[in-house]
Amino acid sequence: RAVPGGSSPAWTQCQQLSQKLCTLAWSAHPLVGHMDLREEGDEETTNDVPHIQCGDGCDPQGLRDNSQFCLQRIHQGLIFYEKLLGSDIFTGEPSLLPDSPVGQLHASLLGLSQLLQPEGHHWETQQIPSLSPSQPWQRLLLRFKILRSLQAFVAVAARVFAHGAATLSP
């Protein structure tokens, strides 16, 4: 078990699941990669979702010194995105297509966050109320932006776990 505040993570297992997350995130919205959504937002909105940043200890040196800081950051982000994908932003109208990978993506986020969960702590998933946009086109745009930022987040997480599996596994 990977454990913010505990022992060493199952790096290889985390690597495999994070790799799967990358694939799912891109298949959930493959066109997302062709647009720069920073144009849509501004300096303020870039803070809205969790990012893995320089001070989070996710660099090779930081992981070697104490991987818990980085793992905690990844854990927080996974939980945030897992809740987001389970919220009315994604469950409301317009309905997702039956074969949409968002459901799988949601489940995989939950799976990886549970791998990174401290022993004896059980995260309860719940439907979170939110001020979801009233217009379907606004909701679609919001989904698009969320998936774009999730792609960036899981790409960094996958690199972290790949490095951990290669250099930090027992």
């Epitope: 937002g41 501004d42 303020e44 909105t45 803070n47 809205d48 979702v49 969790p50 927080q76 945030f80 809740k83 987001l84 919220s87 932003i89 979170i128 109320p129 939110s130 001020l131 979801s132 946009p133 606004q138 919001l142 932006k145 969320i146 930022s149």
Partner: nanobody, 118 residues
Amino acid sequence: EVQLVESGGGLVQAGGSLRLSCAASGSISEFNVIGWHRQAPGKERELVASITGHDSTYYTGSVKGRFTISRDNAKTTVYLQMNSLKPEDTAVYYCAVRQILRREYDYWGQGTQVTVSS
């Protein structure tokens, strides 16, 4: 429906401090951002600072290092600690809520007056 109630405004001398509070009720979640805005007489309303559900903060240039935005543990009240106040900080301060990744704020409070005298 969301209700926002601001308090803590008043008259203060330049260099002084004030702490504004914004009490939010209704369906606020971690997918919302709460921002403090201000409007000085004859000027457009501007964003001062904002805070997300995961406690990431944003400040406009003119208040960086002087103002601090924070929230209580229950995440229902947001504070704006204003230090080293200047006469140009005089304005009506409004609390507002928006959805993450959207620039438009959806719900607004009534505002609280802050006057900084020289």
